[in-house]
């Protein structure tokens, strides 16, 4: 058997660090057997069999010029083997970032914090940390570890499925190369890393007869679980074309009536989502949708002035593209009585 331990990596390659002493090992001889060393393709003897170093070649303070293929020969001139030297660095701790688009699963991505120049792989696992009692801050021995399955296509990402929203997890990402291993431990809780995907299906429609109104509606992101134990709240922004500043409102449900639109101008609208108890952070904004208020056609029946302030306006139920969610969809407000002044303007 070879006296040379096979480092992780391709066969026949041995590894060292620039600026450090490097030992190359002749693979096809018995440990301690004296050998001669040559650079591949060069007749010059690098180290003779009388060096006292047996089957090893020592390179002091290796640098990039030492990289390449070496040949070792036994005393009788037989080929002891060929060795390729590759220089690089031990792993540094990778940088890890975890995110969750829903409250049941999370993913972690990683990237090297320093390039080693050597073949590298990553080992990924996680533990669940549990508290030892309601009033105790001590943590029990954590459960696990379990593997964090990596993306099959080689992306630097692994996914934990079926996570518990109230638990803490410790992620372990270990960078491994032939010169060693280095581990990053990252404590994460779903509550803090939760960031929903942006709402989908944003539509902006005019409200006939109301030149300062637009109705925006949207649906939950598809990634949010269908039977949610946790609801989302929303933030909506809108602005007229060519206007730099956004106006922001927090709608009560899956739609909002904008009552101060600029008559005749197209408006951009976008919407963002967040866990309704403020866990995590707001999603990115949805793609903008555009709508223009209707021209000021006066409705056939104009209520008397006094009624504008006292009569709640009643609208027929509007279909929504979302499945019915009684707890999420308040009765839509096509004509919101918050802004009676705008209705007076229609009469002017």
């Amino acid at each position: 058997s070879s006296p040379c331990p096979q480092a992780w990596g391709p066969p026949g390659v041995q590894y060292g660090q620039p600026g450090r002493s490097v030992k190359l090992c002749c693979p096809g001889v018995t440990a301690g057997d004296p050998v001669s060393w040559f650079r591949d393709g060069e007749p010059k003897l690098l180290q003779g069999p009388d060096s006292g170093l047996g089957h090893e070649l020592v390179l002091a303070q290796a640098d990039s010029t030492d990289e390449g293929t070496y040949i070792c020969q036994t005393l009788d001139g037989a080929l002891g083997g060929t060795v390729t030297l590759q220089l690089g660095y031990p792993p540094a701790r990778p940088v890890v970032s975890c995110q969750a688009a829903d409250y049941e699963n999370f993913s972690c991505t990683w990237s090297p914090s320093q390039i080693s120049g050597l073949p590298t792989r990553y080992l990924t696992s996680y533990r669940k940390k549990t508290v030892l009692g309601a009033d105790s801050q001590r943590r029990s021995p954590s459960t696990g570890p379990w593997p964090c399955p990596q993306d099959p296509l080689g992306a630097a990402r692994c996914v934990v499925h079926g996570a518990e929203f109230w638990s803490q997890y410790r992620i372990n990402v270990t960078e491994v190369n032939p010169l060693g291993a280095s581990t990053r431990l990252l404590d994460v809780s779903l509550q803090s890393i939760l960031r929903p995907d942006p709402p989908q299906g944003l539509r902006v429609e005019s409200v006939p007869g109301y030149p300062r109104r637009l109705r925006a509606s949207w649906t939950y992101p598809a990634s949010w679980p269908c039977q949610p134990h946790f609801l989302l709240k929303f933030r909506l922004q809108y602005r007229p074309a060519q206007h730099p500043a956004w106006s922001t409102v927090e709608p009560a449900g899956l739609e909002e009536v904008i009552t101060d639109a600029v008559a005749g101008l197209p408006h951009a609208v976008r919407v963002s989502a967040r866990d309704f108890l403020d866990a995590g952070t707001w999603s990115t904004w949805s793609p903008e949708a555009w709508g223009t208020p209707s021209t000021g056609t006066i409705p056939k029946e104009i209520p008397a002035w006094g009624q504008l302030h006292t009569q709640p306006e009643v609208e027929p139920q509007v279909d929504s593209p979302a499945p019915p969610r009684p707890s999420l969809q308040p009765h839509p407000r096509l004509l919101d009585h918050r802004d009676s002044v705008e209705q007076v303007a229609v009469l002017a």
Epitope: R93, V95, Q114
Partner: antibody, heavy 118, light 107 residues
């Protein structure tokens, strides 16, 4: 010679923007994480932001999150810091620093002064 | 974030004296602690990395020790060129933090 050289500092009004650059030479820039650290006049050091070699992961101090953006161009051996919505408390000397790894800084630039004042 | 405290905030010592600075982390940071020297008007310089390793080219009179939450930085024999402010810095967390610094001058 191994060195980092910052540029782009200057006087800017509150709410304004500035883009700092850091030119690296003498080492393989694309192999290392890079960092911005700042120091307010007469004060201590404050980590601002870091970026990994491939540029795909970044980290920010809470005090600058959402206002500053770190980036790098490995083909130009240059690190950047885009600073928006600047505040008086952002006034400082901004240093660019190199890894090894993430969070250790073995090479520093000389710094560039950013003054935010009306 | 992990908080770092240093003591003393300043000290005066004579040339040749042994100088010790302590640094404490608000939580366990293993040995992920660095020490930097900053002279007036200059950029900081890494002296000690990972609690006890001397950075290449740094004089051997500088040393560091400790792990967990308590760390010590020592100058075995203070020299005039050591007048500076010294900072500890943790990198256990992915958001590094510095101590407030210790200003060292000569009596």
């Amino acid at each position: 010679e191994v060195q980092l050289l910052e540029s782009g500092g200057g006087l800017v009004q509150p709410g304004g923007s500035l883009r700092l650059s850091c030119a690296a030479s003498g080492f393989t820039f694309s192999w290392y994480s890079m960092t911005w650290v700042r120091q307010a006049p007469g004060k201590g050091l404050e980590w601002v932001s870091s970026i990994v070699p491939y540029g795909d992961l970044t980290q920010y101090a809470d005090s600058v999150k959402g206002r500053f953006t770190i980036s790098r161009d490995n083909s130009k051996n240059t690190l950047y810091l885009q600073m928006n919505s600047l505040r008086a408390e952002d006034t400082a000397v901004y240093y660019c620093a190199k890894g090894p790894g993430w969070g250790s800084f073995d090479l520093w630039g000389r710094g560039t002064l950013v003054t935010v004042s009306s | 974030d992990i908080q770092m405290t240093q003591s003393p905030s300043s000290l005066s010592a004579s040339v040749g004296d042994r100088v010790t600075i302590t640094c404490q982390a608000s939580q366990d940071i293993n040995n992920y602690l660095n020490w930097y020297q900053q002279k007036p008007g200059k950029a900081p310089k890494l002296l000690i990395y990972d609690a006890s390793n001397l950075q290449t080219g740094v004089p051997s009179r500088f040393s560091g020790s400790g792990s967990g939450t308590d760390f010590t930085f020592t100058i075995s024999s203070l020299q005039p060129e050591d007048i500076a402010t010294y900072y500890c810095q943790q990198h256990e967390s992915q958001s590094p933090t510095f101590g407030p610094g210790t200003k060292v001058d000569i009596k």
